[in-house]
């Protein structure tokens, strides 16, 4: 089939011991080949400071995945999910103040 | 090749302006931050700020804020570093570098130098 | 702001030495956030060591790195000619990002 580019879209859970769980998940992409990643000032965090979900169809002939991790509260500007997907990429910010959630189609 | 190669040498009266520009090469323009560092003559190096060119996220540091402003171009995948407000002490060689996937400064330009003097 | 502490300012060494660089900083961080970089005259930085003990690409295995929390070491084993040249230590774990004020390796 022909590419999909993913949506992806960046949440923030609630503060835990000043810090904060950011997910970023990734859906709706096709071939299933994606590399999603966060990101410290623009640097990849360490492997054990991230989790990953498996690549899972959605159902629809495409797939979804996450990524999340922990950082701390205040140093939100810091941190991007960086998403590269059949010669695509993009860099997702958290979302800062009131706002929970951030969502971006690639095209 | 990765490259990031910078504008030439300036002069400077005090007060006054002066934009360094710093054109990357060899990889997707957007899809690392670039950083930016001065180099005081014989001293050591001093963190200026980054920008993320993908979502033009600025990061300063915070010495630097009121003065400097980054900004890039996505049409012809440059950088720019300007520092307002000259004084002799912003005499120095201007670094841009790019982010890597494991350290914060991986690939350097070559430099700028930026002489202040009246 | 975490303050980086090389020491010592210069190191006096003949080829074929041995070359021990210490990085101290004000405060821990994670040995993730921990970099080296090789400066010679006239040229811009180059990326030595990653994470604290991790060799750039086409670095010399005769470079490595050590440390954890506030005490990290460069160590060249075996000095060549093109090696004497300012080495920085930088950390990226807090903001702003700081870099040590650099050891000179001389020839003796």
């Known amino acids: 089939g022909s590419t999909v580019p993913p949506m992806v879209n960046v949440t923030c859970s609630e503060v835990s011991e000043g810090n904060i769980t950011v997910t970023c998940r990734a859906s709706s992409f096709y071939p299933r080949n994606i590399t999603l990643t966060w990101r410290q000032d623009g640097v990849s965090l360490s492997h054990n400071t991230q989790q990953w979900g498996d690549v899972l169809p959605d159902g629809n002939g495409t797939y979804q995945t996450w990524v999340a991790t922990r950082i701390r509260q205040g140093e939100e500007q810091r941190f991007t999910c960086y998403m590269e997907h059949s010669g695509n990429h993009g860099t997702h910010p958290v979302p800062s103040g009131n706002s929970h959630h951030h969502h971006h189609h690639h095209h | 090749e990765i490259q990031l190669v910078q504008s030439g040498a300036e002069v400077k009266k005090p007060g006054s302006s002066v934009k360094v520009s710093c054109k990357p090469s060899g990889y997707a323009f957007t899809s690392n931050n670039i950083y930016w560092v001065r180099q005081a003559p014989g001293q050591g190096l001093e963190w200026i700020g980054y920008?993320?060119?993908?979502?033009?996220?600025?990061i300063y540091n915070q010495q630097f804020k009121d003065r400097a402003t980054l900004t890039v171009d996505k049409s012809t995948s440059t950088a720019y570093m300007e520092l307002s407000s000259l004084r002799s002490e912003d005499t120095a060689v201007y670094y841009c570098?790019?982010?890597?996937?494991?350290?914060?400064?991986?690939?350097w330009g070559q430099g700028t130098l930026v002489t202040v003097s009246s | 702001e975490i303050v980086l502490t090389q020491s010592p300012a210069t190191l006096s060494l003949s080829p074929g030495e041995r070359a021990t660089l210490s990085c101290s900083a004000s405060s821990s961080i994670s040995s993730n956030y921990l970099h080296w970089y090789q400066q010679k005259p006239g040229q811009a930085p180059r990326l030595l060591i990653y994470r604290t003990s991790n060799l750039a690409s086409g670095i010399p295995a005769r470079f490595s790195g050590s440390g954890s929390g506030t005490d990290f070491t460069l160590t060249i084993s075996s000095l060549e000619p093109e090696d004497f040249a300012v080495y920085y230590c930088q950390q990226g774990g807090s903001l702003p990002l700081t870099f040590g004020q650099g050891t000179k390796v001389e020839i003796k």
């Open positions: 570098s790019r982010s890597g996937e494991r350290s914060n400064f991986d690939y």
């Open positions: 920008i993320d060119p993908y979502i033009g996220r600025i």
